[in-house]
Amino acid sequence: EETEIVMPTPKPELWAETNFPLAPWKNLTLWCRSPSGSTKEFVLLKDGTGWIATRPASEQVRAAFPLGALTQSHTGSYHCHSWEEMAVSEPSEALELVGTDILPKPVISASPTIRGQELQLRCKGWLAGMGFALYKEGEQEPVQQLGAVGREAFFTIQRMEDKDEGNYSCRTHTEKRPFKWSEPSEPLELVIKEMYPKPFFKTWASPVVTPGARVTFNCSTPHQHMSFILYKDGSEIASSDRSWASPGASAAHFLIISVGIGDGGNYSCRYYDFSIWSEPSDPVELVVTEFYPKPTLLAQPGPVVFPGKSVILRCQGTFQGMRFALLQEGAHVPLQFRSVSGNSADFLLHTVGAEDSGNYSCIYYETTMSNRGSYLSMPLMIWVTDTFPKPWLFAEPSSVVPMGQNVTLWCRGPVHGVGYILHKEGEATSMQLWGSTSNDGAFPITNISGTSMGRYSCCYHPDWTSSIKIQPSNTLELLVTGLLPKPSLLAQPGPMVAPGENMTLQCQGELPDSTFVLLKEGAQEPLEQQRPSGYRADFWMPAVRGEDSGIYSCVYYLDSTPFAASNHSDSLEIWVTDKPPKPSLSAWPSTMFKLGKDITLQCRGPLPGVEFVLEHDGEEAPQQFSEDGDFVINNVEGKGIGNYSCSYRLQAYPDIWSEPSDPLELVGAAGPVAQECTVG
């Protein structure tokens, strides 16, 4: 059986008003006001279950219940509730009407009764403009009287002594003589407690901690020079002696340097001063996590909530009979707790506002064994908004897809657990994908054909009724390639350019009325599209940077068949660098000279339009330059043996040389030197 501990809607205030101050019972109106701005209406009840009326909340978040002239049928105890969209408040204080010509019965209450301390008695009188009188049992005359002071009065006993103990009641009366009196309030017994009021007790960090965390408990009271005791599960575990040094409030800090799994539990504290002890503090539940598997947290009906509406967060655990806690990122203490017999708990966030947006998580823990807790659930983002955020639509691996290949369109956004809908321009029906716990929606298109190309957008599609506005994503253009002859792509002034320089990529097609699309390997979307008047598009790249390096290609499509694109141009590698990459150097047929045979050294670089130079043992080789990178070496008198490397420079930038290649060693054939011999 689940024990509901919903954070209650704050209780409303009930009072009475009249336009006959000398005889209020001639025309009485009860008013109910709520401190909660999300109150929709008010209900007035009589004697607990008699439904008197329901009225909508005014702009001042209150409602009037006119009773008119009091009759015998009006006698009874009234209270009101405020009513929100999905919750009813605690009842107001009860207003008792005891007769047809008598004021409502007041209610008396008091602050803690501590010897030697000031005590305040509150008398709530319901009607404004009344006088108040405080009575003590056994005394004929009022102990104190106060004039018209609003709907309630505070009587003060300066210093509580034994003689002040006893039963007190209060009465209200009309402002002008002859006074008309109320019945006395129910009596309140004042007994001096040999106890101080409870201390204020808290943890400095969250009371939900991971093993090894540092925890400080703070116990404080306004009373001076107190000693403190710390309890765990009712047993004393630490104490702190009084401090005479500091005037004013007393406080003690209890530190656990490194929390262990057995340190969880219910902590409380008390303070004392010689023979007088305080009441125990409210307990703090310290929960040590990471003992049980993590729960899952889901939002119902969904994680996006219209302001003023309510949402249920369901924490699904693994074991029965645990206690659950709901946490919000940035909040010091858990927002709510639930003790359940099952393995899940529902937390209601009612009438949410913008401040309720954020990441929520939950844990569960056992209350019998040191509050051993689970890992935290994965965070769940709750959005309180009247408009869904825009999702982002993109294609993987690219929005430019060769005919027959596969592509996945991803609709991705920050909201988890919501469905997505994919819409193609010009089509009546949309593809739907219900979101799961992941925060993205995949729409796979296999074996792509011409029917798949076009403009797409997507939006969130919650599977619950919602007044939250939906925004479409960006538009994604899906091009299918391989349907026209390929264009050519070249770089001006060349494929290598220094950082900060400008370059132009020229895509040359064969057909008129074409739109050209520039692509870069690794990019999911085209870099740029152009519709030139001629057959060529010039893609201007000003002030290039290192990240502009890469492999480029281009395609084109015709005005008459947009999105049906050509084959890709040949790839073009662009280098943005001050130092061109080093070439490679190899020997053909091998690095070993054979008698009378030459060796060709082949220097190869990644860029076209270059001039190569060869170095031999650190000096320029006799055949110094080559445009194709081939150098022929002979071994006349053994001079060809040694270490070679090569470099190149771009014809467009003759002052910039590449790094040298890795060195390559040429050697002579092993064995005795060959002798010439003649046959005589």
């Epitope: 109106t29 929709k40 209406e41 209900v43 009840l45 607990g48 279950t49 008699g50 439904w51 008197i52 009326a53 329901t54 009225r55 909508p56 005014s58 409602a63 009037a64 006119p66 509730h81 009513w83 929100e84 969209e85 999905m86 919750a87 009813v88």
Partner: antibody, heavy 117, light 112 residues
């Protein structure tokens, strides 16, 4: 969309009692009042009383006081109306209706109770 | 109890023409909060009643703007600007200012 589903038609003897149920689904049950309205054959509508399930609070029309009892079970989101001491003039269609301060916005389909010896 | 009186009890109408129903209460339905607690309901043949207008002049969700409510104190009117064939049925006014809530006797709207 809120739905109020009522129990089926019944034939009762004079002097007996009848208990009509009204099950709410697709909306928030506890946060509304449920009223019971009856309509005798060929006649107009007559409000019998109402209940606020979350508070267990009721109000009965004076002419049904002592004969009618309205209850609600929050766990099953069902409201009940029991009418005792049945007479032939209690033959009517009995409706449940959900309401707050803006009228009865959802109605059940009605339950015909026939009182006949 | 507050007595609600409707006129006429029967109203033959022509589609496309306006129609109006009157309702009088035996005491004022104007509350001190400024609201007038009068509602209008339509019961189509063989169906449950449905809410048309609440708190004097507020149209219920999904109700066409052909329907409007007006009045003050003790005299109230429901107007249909252009009657449609689907508008036939019994129209009831109901007061909600105090318990017990009470209905008018009903006005039967039928096509001529």
């Amino acid at each position: 969309q809120m739905q109020l589903v009522q129990s089926g038609a019944e034939v009762k003897k004079p002097g007996s009692s009848v208990k009509v149920s009204c099950k709410a689904s697709g909306g928030t049950f506890s946060s509304y009042a449920i009223s019971w309205v009856r309509q005798a054959p060929g006649q107009g509508l007559e409000w019998m009383g109402g209940i606020i399930p979350v508070l267990g609070a009721t109000n009965y029309a004076q002419r049904f006081q002592g004969r009618v009892t309205m209850t609600a079970d929050e766990s099953t989101t069902t409201a009940y109306m029991e009418l005792s001491g049945l007479r032939s003039e209690d033959t009517a269609v009995y409706y449940c209706a959900r309401g707050r301060s803006w009228g009865f916005d959802y109605w059940g389909h009605g339950t015909l109770i026939t009182v006949s010896s | 109890d507050i007595v609600m009186t409707q006129t006429p009890l029967s109203l033959p109408v022509t589609p496309g023409q306006p129609a109006s129903i009157s309702c009088k209460s035996s005491q004022s339905l104007l509350h001190s909060d400024g609201n007038t607690y009068l509602d209008w309901y339509l019961q189509k043949p063989g169906q449950s009643p449905q809410l048309l207008i609440y708190t004097l002049s507020h149209r219920a969700s999904g109700v066409p703007d052909r329907f409007s409510g007006s009045g003050s104190g003790t005299d109230f009117t429901l107007k249909i600007s252009r009657v449609e064939a689907d508008d036939v049925g019994l129209y009831y006014c109901m007061q909600r200012i105090e318990f017990p809530y009470t209905f008018g006797q009903g006005t039967k709207v039928e096509i001529k």
